[in-house]
Interface confidence: low
């Protein structure tokens, strides 16, 4: 946390984009190139984040805000503020140390990221399997076998695919 500055503190007058320069009798100096201060009253400017390697620049650094990075095509962000990039895989796969591998039987992944998760066990809810699972899709559960009277028909809706970008970050 930052202690509340006294009313006498000349640094409190320095706006975002500047710093209170102790070497110059506490006047407000603009942040040097490739640095920023997002709040007023700062005694130093922070170095701008550089989006290098697998990171690419989503938003350039300005004197008042840090750069924001995302990942190059074929990779997606992980962690707060896109602190890491992880390789994309296809649906029906997960990333392992040896690269993208197909989901094992009984598991699925409907996204380009994340891990293969087990198919829903319909019987735990007293239901039956209406549509079998695949590597890319979960099973679709339907009414319990007892609920299906002879002659009754059911229309199987497709398993809903989650929108990309809604998986763990």
């Amino acid at each position: 946390f930052e202690r509340t500055r006294s009313l006498q503190d000349p640094c409190s007058n320095c706006p975002a984009g500047t710093f209170c320069d102790n070497n110059r009798n506490q006047i407000c100096s603009p942040c040097p190139p490739n640095s920023f201060s997002s709040a007023g009253g700062q005694r130093t400017c922070d170095i701008c984040r550089q989006c290098k390697g697998v990171f690419r620049t989503r938003k350039e650094c300005s004197s008042t805000s840090n750069a924001e990075c995302d990942c190059t095509p074929g990779f997606h962000c992980l962690g707060a503020g896109c602190s890491m990039c992880e390789q994309d895989c296809k649906q029906g796969q997960e990333l392992t140390k040896k690269g993208c591998k197909d989901c094992c039987f009984g598991t699925f992944n409907d996204q380009k990221r994340g891990i293969c998760r087990p198919w829903t066990n319909c019987s735990l809810d007293g239901k039956s399997v209406l549509v079998n699972g695949t590597k890319e899709r979960d099973v679709v559960c339907g009414p319990s076998p007892a609920d299906l009277s002879p002659g009754a028909s059911s229309v199987t809706p497709p398993a809903p695919a989650r929108e990309p970008g809604h998986s763990p970050q």
Epitope: K52, S83, M84, G114
Partner: antibody, heavy 121, light 107 residues
Framework: QVQLVQSGAEVKKPGSSVKLSCKAS????????INWVRQAPGQGLEWMGN????????NYNQKFKDRVTLTVDKSTSTAYMELSSLRSEDTAVYYC??????????????WGQGTLVTVSS | DIQMTQSPSSLSASLGERVTITCKAS??????LSWYQQKPGKAPKTLIY???RLVDGVPSRFSGSGSGQDFTLTISSLQPEDIATYYC?????????FGGGTKVEIK
């Protein structure tokens, strides 16, 4: 085989700085993050930061951001961690450890033997 | 930062006994959790990553479970060589943060 060999123990005065080294061998140095983790005597583990040798991209734990500098020398496959403004509570064993390139499955699979830093007046 | 609360801080169990250690995250960390074993004077060793995946070469008596905020490390049958301190680590967000550790001793 993969090895991370760290520099020897250090005794430092409060207010001074220490620079530790971690020499990697047995793998492609550029393709793994080097992390620094410390452990005070009888205490738990604390991540300090990491560096990606290929382009020297760094992430720092905000707790240490103003006092820690991570660097690498690719020509010797060596990572360095400098900690400044030392205080007695920085007395700890400092480990370097690696994690794989892009796949952020943070398995610290190989560790250095650790360097004991003692800060005492 | 994400806080990791590990319990118990220490435990004493008999050889062959089942041992359970829990770790609770201050927010949802998906399955981005690993478990480490540390013996005195040694560097930690990874046992499990992604909450439930055993690292190659780790005995199958070790297992991990959980997702979201609550995670468990289980040793199905405690062996003498399992005497150590165990740490959980979240790596869903930087900075990665460790639990406080659980010291496992023989009764």
């Amino acid at each position: 085989q993969v090895q991370l060999v760290q520099s020897g123990a250090e005794v430092k005065k409060p207010g001074s700085s220490v620079k530790l080294s971690c020499k990697a061998s047995g793998y492609t140095f550029s393709s793994y993050w080097i992390n620094w983790v410390r452990q005070a005597p009888g205490q738990g583990l604390e991540w300090m930061g990491n560096i990606y040798p290929s382009d020297s991209y760094t992430n720092y734990n905000q707790k240490f951001k103003d006092r820690v500098t991570l660097t690498v020398d690719k020509s010797t496959s060596t990572a360095y961690m400098e900690l400044s403004s030392l205080r007695s509570e920085d007395t700890a064993v400092y480990y370097c450890t690696r994690t794989w390139e892009f796949y952020y499955d943070s398995v610290f699979d190989y560790w250095g033997q650790g360097t004991l830093v003692t800060v005492s007046s | 930062d994400i806080q990791m609360t590990q319990s118990p801080s220490s435990l004493s169990a008999s050889l062959g006994e089942r041992v359970t250690i829990t770790c609770k995250a201050s927010q949802d960390i998906n399955s981005y959790l690993s478990w480490y074993q540390q013996k005195p004077g040694k560097a930690p060793k990874t046992l499990i990553y992604r909450a439930n995946r055993l690292v190659d070469g780790v005995p199958s008596r070790f297992s991990g479970s959980g997702s979201g905020q609550d995670f468990t490390l289980t040793i199905s049958s405690l062996q003498p060589e399992d005497i150590a301190t165990y740490y959980c680590l979240q790596y869903d967000e930087l900075p990665p943060t460790f639990g406080g550790g659980t010291k496992v001793e023989i009764k």
